[in-house]
């Protein structure tokens, strides 16, 4: 004969545990029903009556099957440097993440507690490592033969143009200037235009996130900004 299915509340067999989505109530000494996500225990079970569940009130939630007397409060509204990536509902907490051009300087269990603006690399410096959601850009000086003339959280150093005759030699913050004969550029033909990354940062100046122009393939002087360090080396 099949074993009889016990309905909550019921006394468990000695040494056995309550079933999935049930909990053992110490007072009643019975296995009782848990409340579903989005609800909480309004009345705890007794030996003769099961748990009475009620929906969470506005701005409160429960994410798991539970028997808590009150739902949890949703986190405070996202700050101006954040975007709400998950709204507060009866079943889930609000999640705030940093907006583009910022990174999470202090994280919490889900989302971010404190966002900080991505550092910008000054001219003569490029993005050695792009920022990620949780880490800042690392700026380093341009290596010999490369330059960056921008203040940016995304631009890398790029090679000086190669001149037949140099009018002004390039340095870390300025491209070489050629005499009237057209220069050759150390860029492969059909070079891809790099899209603006979602979030990256750079050196020594107060950041104000700004779009960064992709590298120009028409090599007229003066040169535009360095190509951005597109994407982010994520954690």
């Amino acid at each position: 004969l099949p074993a009889q299915v016990a309905f909550t509340p019921y006394a468990p067999e000695p040494g056995s545990t309550c079933r999935l989505r049930e909990y053992y109530d110490q007072t009643a000494q019975m296995c009782c029903s848990k409340c579903s996500p989005g609800q909480h225990a309004k009345v705890f079970c007794t030996k003769t009556s099961d748990t009475v569940c009620d929906s969470c009130e506005d701005s409160t939630y429960t994410q798991l099957w539970n028997w808590v007397p009150e739902c949890l409060s949703c986190g405070s509204r996202c700050s101006s440097d954040q975007v709400e990536t998950q709204a507060c509902t009866r079943e889930q907490n609000r999640i705030c993440t940093c907006r583009p051009g910022w990174y999470c300087a202090l994280s919490k269990q889900e989302g971010c507690r404190l966002c900080a603006p991505l550092r910008k690399c000054r001219p003569g410096f490029g993005v050695a490592r792009p920022g990620t959601e949780t880490s800042d850009v690392v700026c380093k000086p341009c290596a010999p033969g490369t330059f960056s003339n921008t203040t940016s959280s995304t631009d890398i150093c790029r090679p000086h143009q190669i001149c037949n005759v140099v009018a002004i030699p390039g340095n870390a913050s300025m491209d070489a200037v050629c005499t009237s004969t057209s220069p050759t550029r150390s860029m492969a033909p059909g070079a891809v235009h790099l899209p603006q990354p979602v979030s990256t940062r750079s050196q020594h100046t107060q950041p104000t996130p700004e779009p960064s122009t992709a590298p120009s393939t028409s090599f007229l002087l003066p040169m535009g900004p360095s190509p951005p360090a597109e994407g982010s080396t994520g954690d």
């Epitope: 490029g126 000086p141 290596a143 490369t146 597109e230 982010s232 080396t233």
Partner: antibody
Framework: EVQLQQSGPELRRPGSSVKLSCKAS????????LHWVKHSPEHGLEWIGW????????KYGQKFQSKATLTADTSSNAAYMQLSSLTSEDSATYFC???????????WGQGASVTVSS | DIVMTQSPTSMSISVGDRVTLNCKAS??????VDWYQQKTGQSPKVLLY???IRYTGVPDRFTGSGSGTEFTFTITNMQAEDLAVYFC?????????FGSGTKLEIK
Amino acid sequence: EVQLQQSGPELRRPGSSVKLSCKASGYSITDYLLHWVKHSPEHGLEWIGWIDPEDGKTKYGQKFQSKATLTADTSSNAAYMQLSSLTSEDSATYFCAANSGTGTMDAWGQGASVTVSS
Amino acid sequence: DIVMTQSPTSMSISVGDRVTLNCKASQNVGSNVDWYQQKTGQSPKVLLYKASIRYTGVPDRFTGSGSGTEFTFTITNMQAEDLAVYFCMQSKSYPITFGSGTKLEIK
């Protein structure tokens, strides 16, 4: 350009540790991030991590988090990698590489061979 | 981890040939791919960064293209001194990962 000079080959017993050095000349190591890369016939090139000698900040690949420790000494213009609890799996050639504002590994050391054998 | 699948593994070529190598990323890496050359007994040397930017001092016979998941590295007019192993590397996300390399040999 920066040149990176690595320490010589090392032979170690299983369970011991080894410290490799990478000395920069021509430029200050603070001008670069310094990466370490493992090269073995079985796994090819594997990124271990980087250190920013300017502030000592490090970033490790998860696989090497408990294996490698990266340090730098600005006074000697050198970076170091210590490998602990060595096993035969750690037998490989290890490269250091300098990363400037180009975002790439501009210059590499000549490599240091580590052999772990009993 | 992002897997960089490089093809072919090896290639026999003649001086003057046009050589094309491919690198395929297991997920979108934008343009965050570098190409390196490693000659026998030497350390690697960067040739191209950000998929297509030729590093300073690198001859213009080396070119690169691609973005997203498909990348191409080309040597036009192969020279004897170009015999080496070439590998790609992605730095879009940690851990940084490398292709297994392509060995160029003389036919």
